[in-house]
C-alpha cells in the first residue's frame, strides 16, 4: 500500500559516537525522496533533511538538547517531483526507527592517550578529554561534563620487553602508576560505562610507548 | 507513582457541550504526547484525539473532528476535551492516556462518563 | 483508516491452558501495534507494544509476535486474574482499535 512506486524506507539504524548521531535507512531512491522526522516521547515532530535523495540525515543538532530523552525517528517517502503525494491511509509512506536514547546508547568513540609523564616509580597517563557536541551554556561539554562519574576509564600497560599486561581503573582522565625504574612501559586506555547495558566499552586507544619519538611529555 | 484523574463528565442534552479534564501527576507531563479514548457501553475501545506534549500537534479521529478540541496547560499538568455539539452516539466513558509519541498508550485513567441524551 | 480484526471475538479457555488470539491489519503496520487487557469496569492496561516488547511489570507469560498484517497475543499457561477483554491498537497510521476478543472460563 502507500503512494504509487514509492517505497517506504527499512533498515532504519542510529549510527552515534560520542553524541554525533545520524541516522541511516534503505534503500538508495529510484524516483523518490525522503523527509526524516525526529521526537522524543511528546510527540513534538520536528523534521529534518527535506526531500533528500540522502539514505542518512544527521540529528546530532536534536537530540543533543537532551541526550537523557528517548528519541523516534521516522523516515517519509515522496515521490520525486511530486512530495505532495500522499499514500492509501491520506499520509504519506513512512517507517519507523528504533527507540534511540543517546546518554544510553551513543558510543564511546576511541579515546587518545593525552601525555605521560615519569617521575621516579610512578607515571602519570592523562586520557584526552574529548569535546563532544553536546552545549550547556553556549559552550560544547566533554565527554567527562556529559557522563561524569558514570564514565571511568581502563588503563593497560606492560613493559615493553614482555607481554603480560597490568590494568588500573580511573572515574577522572588521569592514572597514577607504579612502575620499575629503569624499564619503558606501553599504554593504552579504553572509555567504559559499568551502568550500561549496551555499548558499554570504547575501542582501545592508540597504543603509546615510552622513550619512543612521541617522548613522555606531550600536550 | 504514575496518575491520571479524569472528571467533567455528567449527563448532557444532545447540541450541549462539556469539558473534560484530566489532572496528570508523577511524571514530567510535558515529556509526553497525551490522549483521549472512549468506549460506548458494552462496545470497544475507540480513540478520540491526541496532543503532543507542547500542545502544537492536534489529531482527532474524523468522528469528532470539529466539534472536538483537545488542549493542554502543562503549568497545570491538565489534559482537556473540549466537547461541543454532542450527540447520543458521543454517551461512552472517556479515558485519559499518556501516549509517548502519540502511539500508543501506557497509562490510562479510571475514566469519566459522559451521557448524552434527553 | 486502517481496520483492525480480531479474532476469536470469545474464547472459552481454562486455567493453564495456552491462549492465542489474532488480529489482522487491512494493511501493512510494520510492527506498530500494541496490546491492552481490560477487565470490566476497568481502564485498559498496557501489555505489549510494538508487536513484541513486553511492558514493563506484565508477567512474562504474555507475549506478542507477528509483523506486516498479522499479529498474536499469546498467554502461555492461563491464569485465574487473566480472564479479561483484549485489544489490539495499530499505531501506524493515526491510531485504531480491534473489536476486541473476551476470554472467558470454560
Known amino acids: 500500500s502507500g503512494t504509487t512506486n514509492t517505497v517506504a524506507a527499512y533498515n532504519l539504524t542510529w549510527k552515534s559516537t560520542n553524541f554525533k548521531t545520524i541516522l541511516e535507512w534503505e534503500p538508495k531512491p529510484v524516483n523518490q525522496v525522503y523527509t526524516v522526522q525526529i521526537s522524543t516521547k511528546s510527540g513534538d515532530w520536528k523534521s529534518k533533511c527535506f526531500y533528500t535523495t540522502d539514505t542518512e540525515c544527521d540529528l546530532t543538532d536534536e537530540i543533543v538538547k537532551d541526550v537523557n530523552q528517548t528519541y523516534l525517528a521516522r523516515v517519509f517517502s515522496y515521490p520525486a517531483g511530486n512530495v505532495e503525494s500522499t499514500g492509501s491511509a491520506g499520509e504519506p509512506l513512512y517507517e519507523n526507527s528504533p527507540e534511540f536514547t543517546p546518554y544510553l546508547e551513543t558510543n564511546l568513540g576511541q579515546p587518545t592517550i593525552q601525555s605521560f609523564e615519569q617521575v621516579g616509580t610512578k607515571v602519570n597517563v592523562t586520557v584526552e578529554d574529548e569535546r563532544t557536541l553536546v552545549r550547556r551554556n553556549n559552550t560544547f561539554l566533554s565527554l567527562r561534563d556529559v557522563f561524569g562519574k558514570d564514565l571511568i576509564y581502563t588503563l593497560y600497560y606492560w613493559k615493553s620487553s614482555s607481554s603480560g599486561k597490568k590494568t588500573a581503573k580511573t572515574n577522572t582522565n588521569e592514572f597514577l602508576i607504579d612502575v620499575d625504574k629503569g624499564e619503558n612501559y606501553c599504554f593504552s586506555v579504553q572509555a567504559v560505562i559499568p551502568s550500561r547495558t549496551v555499548n558499554r566499552k570504547s575501542t582501545d586507544s592508540p597504543v603509546e610507548c615510552m622513550g619512543q619519538e612521541k617522548g613522555e611529555f606531550r600536550e | 507513582e504514575v496518575q491520571l484523574l479524569e472528571s467533567g463528565g455528567g449527563l448532557v442534552q444532545p447540541g450541549g457541550s462539556l469539558r473534560l479534564s484530566c489532572a496528570a501527576s508523577?511524571?514530567?507531563?510535558?515529556?509526553?504526547?497525551m490522549g483521549w479514548v472512549r468506549q460506548a457501553p458494552g462496545k470497544g475501545l475507540e480513540w478520540v484525539s491526541t496532543?503532543?506534549?507542547?500542545?502544537?500537534?492536534?489529531y482527532y479521529a474524523d468522528s469528532v473532528k470539529g466539534r472536538f478540541t483537545i488542549s493542554r496547560d502543562n503549568s497545570k499538568n491538565t489534559l482537556y476535551l473540549q466537547m461541543n455539539s454532542l450527540r447520543a452516539e458521543d454517551t461512552a466513558v472517556y479515558y485519559c492516556?499518556?501516549?509517548?509519541?502519540?502511539?500508543?498508550?501506557?497509562?490510562w485513567g479510571k475514566g469519566t462518563t459522559v451521557t448524552v441524551s434527553s | 483508516d486502517i481496520q483492525m480484526t480480531q479474532s476469536p471475538s470469545t474464547l472459552s479457555a481454562s486455567v493453564g491452558d495456552r491462549v492465542t488470539i489474532t488480529c489482522r491489519a487491512s494493511?501493512?503496520?510494520?510492527?506498530?501495534l500494541a496490546w491492552y487487557q481490560q477487565k470490566p469496569g476497568k481502564a485498559p492496561k498496557l501489555l505489549i507494544y510494538?508487536?513484541?516488547s513486553l511492558e514493563s511489570g506484565v508477567p512474562s507469560r504474555f507475549s506478542g509476535s507477528g509483523s506486516g498484517t498479522e499479529f498474536t497475543l499469546t498467554i502461555s499457561s492461563l491464569q485465574p486474574d487473566d480472564f479479561a477483554t483484549y485489544y489490539c491498537?495499530?499505531?501506524?497510521?493515526?491510531?485504531?482499535f480491534g473489536g476486541g476478543t473476551k476470554v472467558e472460563i470454560k
Open positions: 491498537q495499530q499505531y501506524k497510521s493515526y491510531i485504531t
Open positions: 496532543i503532543s506534549g507542547s500542545g502544537g500537534l492536534t
Open positions: 508523577g511524571f514530567t507531563f510535558s515529556d509526553y504526547a
Open positions: 494493511q501493512s503496520i510494520s510492527s506498530w
Open positions: 492516556a499518556k501516549a509517548p509519541y502519540g502511539y500508543y498508550m501506557d497509562v
Open positions: 510494538k508487536a513484541s
